[in-house]
């Protein structure tokens, strides 16, 4: 993980004939921004696939006012750095592109608009953690002049920001099998991060969170031990009659050496017998060099100038292993929020939200009355990333733009007769009853069953409901 | 799924106007940044402008600000182009394009961006 910086240095004509007039005014005052995305790869089909790497939106620049008569100056720009944070390896190869946005001040309906003045696109190669780089580009009149980094956030550190960190234990050394961690020489490589609670000592592991049992021991964190005081052989049967546990998988069982290593048991553990061309515990090391193109699907190779320098594969998204030969399900990883479907595009990761959610991993909740106008007095109700007008009486709809039809629902009761009114709908009772929508009946006596009738109506009268 | 659907092309002399609209249909689209791009032969598709997903604002390519005009009806599930003054190099074909995102902000100028797009409808000025 880490995060790619973006500094804006100036905006403003570039050189040459044809000066590009000022975008702002007296009559209408501006400002800039700037937005930029990326993704990863330098392959041809980067330019179709979406800011898979992520992108950011400045903040607004100081208001410009051009003085009459001057030629466009550099641009007052937004402070601060556009920063777009990655959550998985740096890729080491990029593609960016970064649109200048000028928002206009006048006296626009519905908020000041916006206008695209300038949009740069570029292919780069950048190891995480080295020097900012500056960068120039041209688009049409207008020059863009900027400088960009990758830096690894901790404990990540390396060209790719996949190599863990952690401060050095011991003050002279490294632990076995740990390189210090250029170029951070008092820190140390991190080793794998085994399953929770796997035991140290007996336990190891070359996945991050797997556990894999030393002879001798057994059980999910292997913390069990292996009793064969009673059992037929060293690796005796499981039986519950001569009381022996089910051993682990021998040390050697589905072959823990790579690159073709052969494996044979020892005391404690295990020995890789590796090929020419490959060493370390598991055989995991070669001798092959960056020139023999050892990496698989566009990863990008670092390091191993000799064959006693171990290389590295820096691997694209959507890769993995020591070679990038792997290819990852990243929807696995469900990186789509809030209900958010998942399409693994190979070249890039995209989610497709839900109503009421947006973003690159739609994490955005949007307010769902936003923007929404109900019409003829109607109030918007938020819910469930969808919105709805509760509208006045006579209008319905979805915005309430539809006059309602107040009778359609035949609220009279008891035969009245509905009428459509301004306000809402009279009902016209039918002899014996009363009330507003004649639900009372009209007892014989004169009276009815409603505590009062209103002043000034008699039984019969058409009531209006209001 | 959503189908976007252009009409309103032809044929129009210099200084003309022509409306274009852009008719959705499959999901309601309000919270969509509808936007247009147009292709002229042997070129990029390049943006125009359009109304973002966020509030609708409207944003422009510099090249059309003060002759093109966008606005959406969102009862109709529809957006519209309106183009006057134009001049033979607007000629091209114009696409609508619809996404939800970015969720702030204007509207991306950049096609790859847009999840959902229309035929297209010819657009030509003659001088």
């Known amino acids: 993980a880490g995060v790619f910086e973006l500094q804006i240095h100036s905006f403003g004509p570039g050189p040459g004939p044809g000066a590009p007039r000022s975008p702002c005014s007296a009559r209408l005052p501006c400002r800039l921004f700037f937005r930029v995305c990326l993704k990863p790869g330098l392959s041809e089909e980067a330019a179709e696939s979406p800011c898979a790497l992520g992108a950011a939106l400045s903040a607004r620049g100081p208001v410009y006012t051009e003085q009459p008569g001057a030629p466009a100056p550099d641009l007052p720009l937004p402070d601060g750095l556009l920063q777009v944070p990655f959550r998985d390896a740096w890729p080491g190869t990029f593609s960016f592109i970064i649109e200048t946005w000028r928002e206009e001040l006048g006296d626009q309906i519905g908020g000041p608009a916006w206008s695209l003045l300038a949009r740069v696109a570029g292919r780069r190669r950048l190891a995480a953690g080295g020097p900012w780089a500056r960068d120039i580009q041209r688009a049409g009149a207008w020059e863009l002049r900027f400088s960009y980094r990758a830096r690894c956030e901790p404990p990540a550190v390396g060209t790719a920001c996949t190599r863990l960190c952690r401060p050095r234990s011991a003050p002279s050394r490294c632990g076995p099998g740990l390189r210090p961690c250029a170029p951070l020489e008092d820190e140390c490589e991190a080793p794998l991060v085994c399953r929770a609670g796997c035991s140290p000592e007996h336990g190891f592991c070359e996945q991050p969170g797997e556990c894999r049992c030393l002879e001798g021991w057994t059980g999910p964190l292997c913390t069990v031990p292996v009793s064969t005081s009673s059992c037929l052989s060293p690796r005796g049967p499981s039986s519950a009659t001569t009381g022996c546990l089910v051993p682990g998988p021998g040390p050697c069982d589905g072959n823990p050496c790579a690159n073709g290593g052969s494996c044979s048991e020892t005391p404690r553990s295990f020995e890789c017998t590796c090929p020419r061309g490959f060493y370390g515990l598991r055989c995991e090391v070669s001798g092959v060099t960056c020139a023999d193109g050892p990496c698989f699907n566009g990863g990008l190779c670092v390091g191993g100038a000799d064959p006693d320098s171990a290389y590295i594969c820096h691997c694209p998204p959507g890769f993995q292993g020591s070679n990038c030969e792997k290819r990852v399900d990243r929807c696995s990883l469900q990186p789509c929020r809030n209900g958010g479907l998942c399409l693994d595009l190979g070249h890039a990761l995209r989610c497709r939200c839900r109503a009421g959610f947006a973003g690159p991993r739609c994490e955005h909740d949007l307010d769902d009355c936003a923007g929404r106008a109900c019409a003829n007095g109607g109030t918007c109700v938020e819910g469930g990333g969808a919105h709805r007008c509760s509208c006045a009486l006579g209008f319905g709809g979805r915005d309430c733009r539809e006059r309602a039809d107040p009778c359609a629902a035949r609220p009279c009761a008891h035969g009245g007769r509905c009428y459509a009114h301004f306000s809402g709908l009279v009902c016209a009772c039918a002899p014996g009853y009363m009330g507003a929508r004649c639900e009372f009946p009209v007892h014989p006596d004169g009276a009815s069953a409603l505590p009062a009738a209103p002043p000034g109506l008699r039984p019969g009268d058409p009531q209006r409901y209001l | 799924q959503v189908q976007l659907v252009e009409s309103g092309g032809g044929l129009v002399q210099a200084g003309g106007s022509l409306r274009l609209s852009c008719a959705a249909s499959g999901r309601t689209t309000s919270r969509y940044s509808m936007v247009w791009f147009r292709q002229a032969p042997g070129q990029e598709r390049e943006f125009v402008g359009g109304?973002?997903?966020?509030?609708?604002?409207?944003a422009y390519a510099d090249s059309v600000k003060g002759r093109f005009t966008f606005s959406r009806d969102n009862a109709k599930n529809t957006g519209y182009l309106q183009m006057s003054s134009l001049r033979p190099d607007d000629t091209a074909v114009y696409y609508c394009a619809a996404d939800t995102n970015p969720p702030y902000g204007p509207p991306w100028s950049t096609p790859s961006e847009y999840e959902y797009w229309g035929h297209g409808t010819q657009v030509t000025v003659s001088s």
């Open positions: 109304n973002s997903a966020h509030d609708g604002r409207s």
